[in-house]
Amino acid sequence: LRLLDHRALVCSQPGLNCTVKNSTCLDDSWIHPRNLTPSSPKNIYINLSVSSTQHGELVPVLHVEWTLQTDASILYLEGAELSVLQLNTNERLCVRFEFLSKLRHHHRRWRFTFSHFVVDPDQEYEVTVHHLPKPIPDGDPNHQSKNFLVPDCEHARMKVTTPCMSSGSLWDPNITVETLDTQHLRVDFTLWNESTHYQILLTSFPHMENHSCFEHMHHIPAPRPEEFHQRSNVTLTLRNLKGCCRHQVQIQPFFSSCLNDCLRHSATVSCPEMPDTPEPIPDYMPLWEPRSGSSDYKDDDDKGSSHHHHHH
C-alpha cells in the first residue's frame, strides 16, 4: 500500500482552490474539536484502475470518487481525509484534501476524485472518506466507508500489471489431465519461455472427502530454449488405493522473477461416475470367491513414480 510516485497531486477544480497533502491519519480536529462540522459524503464509488509509475511499471490503483450532500454544511467544509486500510496487514495510508477557498453552492453537485493509492492483487481494502473538521465526541459521524476487494492475478485487467507479471501471470500452461487407467495419470502442459524447472504436485482424495489419501511430487528439469512454448507431458503413477480417485494436479513454476512464490495452475480429475442403479444381487451365492490377480493395496513404501518428455 503506497502512493503513486510521480504524479503532482491536484484536487483543485473550477470554483475551488485545493491542495493534496500527506496525512498522519490523525487530523488536528480530533485533538481540537470544532463546534460546527460538515455532514458526511453522500456517495463513495470505488473502482480499480491501472496506472504507470515513473519507472514505467503498470500498477493497480484505487479510483475513489465521492460527492457532497447539498446542505448548508458545505459552508463549514474545510477539506477531506482519505484513508485506505489494508485488512490483512492493518497498514493504513492517508491523504488530506485541504480547501484553500470556501465552497459555495453551484448548479452541479460537488464531486471529488483521487486515483493514487497503489494496491496489491488479491487484497481487501477499507476506504474511508472523512469530511473535515471531524465531529466533536458524540457528534454525528461525518465519514463514509466502503470495502473493495482487488482481483487476483487471474483477472484479465490484473494480469498485465507489473506485480502480477512478476509472479508469472502471463504464463498459461493450458493443463490437460487424463486418466490412462486406474494407476496412471497423464499430465500435459505448455512450458514458458524461461529456462527454469517446474514441479508437479499430485494430491489425490477420496470421492467426497478433503483429506488426501495420496501425495506425490514430480520434478521437471529446466527446458532448453528450443523447448520453450512446447507441450510437455508426464505420466504419473498413482497409488492403487480403492476410492482414492479424485486427483488434483498443481504445476508450480520457479521463474526467476518469483522463485518459489510463483502463481500455480491446477487441474482436477473427478472420480468416475457411480452407476445410478445398484448392481442386481444374484439369486444364488457362489461356492467360492474368484481369485484376484492383484491386491487393492500396495505397501506403504511403494511410492508413486513418473516419467516425462517434451513434445516438439
Partner: antibody, heavy 118, light 107 residues
C-alpha cells in the same frame, strides 16, 4: 499501556446465546481492525472473525458463520461477539486480538471462557 | 480455503539444540505468515510476522524463513523458557487460519 480485556463468558446450554465484549485501552482503537480467536480445551488456536476499523469489512470462520456476529463501537473503544445457537464445540477460551501493522496479532486479551453444556 | 499444516506435531530436544519447525500452506500465501508462541495457561505471543521479521522484544535465537507455501521457524539454541506450543498463521486473505501447532519440550 496497551490493553485488551474480554468479558461476558460463562456457561450456557446448547442452543443458547452469549455476548462477549472486549474493552480496548492505550491505543487508537478506531484505527485498527480487530479479531476474535478461540481455543478449545487442550486444542489449538482457531481464528473466529475479523472486523475492519470502520466495520465495512467483516469475515467469519466457516464454523461460526450464520451464528456469530462481530461488531464494534469506536466511541466506546469496544469490540463485541454475539454468539447464538451455541453448540458443544463452541466451548473455548475466547480472545480478542489486535493486528500488528505489517501482519500477525501483537496484542491479546487474557481471554474469557465460554462453556456450552447441557 | 487454504489449509495449514505443521510438522512435527511435537518434539523433544536438549537445551542448546537447534530446533526447526515447518509450516506448509496448501496454496501460495506469499510472505503473509506469522509465528506465535503459547506457554501453558497463557495467551499467544507474536514471535515473527511477514514470514521472517522478528517482533520487537523477541530473542534473536528465533528466526523465520520461507515464502510461497513452505515456511520454517528456527530456534538456534533451545532454552528452558522456550517450552511452549508454536503456531503458524496465514494472513494473506480471510480466513486467517492457524496451523495445528507444534509442542516443544526439553529432553
Amino acid at each position: 499501556e496497551v490493553q485488551l480485556v474480554e468479558s461476558g463468558g460463562g456457561s450456557v446450554q446448547p442452543g443458547g446465546s452469549l455476548r462477549l465484549s472486549c474493552a480496548a485501552s492505550g491505543f487508537t482503537f478506531s484505527s485498527y481492525s480487530m479479531n476474535w480467536v478461540r481455543q478449545a480445551p487442550g486444542k489449538g488456536l482457531e481464528w473466529v472473525s475479523i472486523i475492519s476499523s470502520r466495520s465495512s469489512i467483516i469475515h467469519y470462520a466457516d464454523s461460526v458463520k450464520g451464528r456469530f456476529t462481530i461488531s464494534r463501537d469506536n466511541a466506546k473503544n469496544s469490540l463485541y461477539l454475539q454468539m447464538n445457537s451455541l453448540r458443544d464445540e463452541d466451548t473455548a477460551v475466547y480472545y480478542c486480538a489486535r493486528p500488528k501493522v505489517g501482519g500477525g496479532m501483537d496484542v491479546w486479551g487474557q481471554g474469557t471462557t465460554v462453556t456450552v453444556s447441557s | 480455503d487454504i489449509q495449514m499444516t505443521q510438522s512435527p506435531s511435537s518434539l523433544s530436544a536438549s537445551v542448546g539444540d537447534r530446533v526447526t519447525i515447518t509450516c506448509r500452506a496448501s496454496q501460495g500465501i506469499s510472505n503473509y505468515l506469522a509465528w506465535y508462541q503459547q506457554k501453558p495457561g497463557k495467551f499467544p505471543e507474536l514471535l515473527i510476522y511477514a514470514a521472517s521479521t522478528l517482533q520487537s522484544g523477541v530473542p534473536s535465537r528465533f528466526s523465520g524463513s520461507g515464502s510461497g507455501t513452505d515456511f520454517t521457524l528456527t530456534i538456534s539454541s533451545l532454552q528452558p523458557e522456550d517450552v511452549a506450543t508454536y503456531y503458524c498463521q496465514k494472513y494473506n486473505r480471510a480466513p486467517f487460519t492457524f496451523g495445528p501447532g507444534t509442542k516443544v519440550d526439553i529432553k
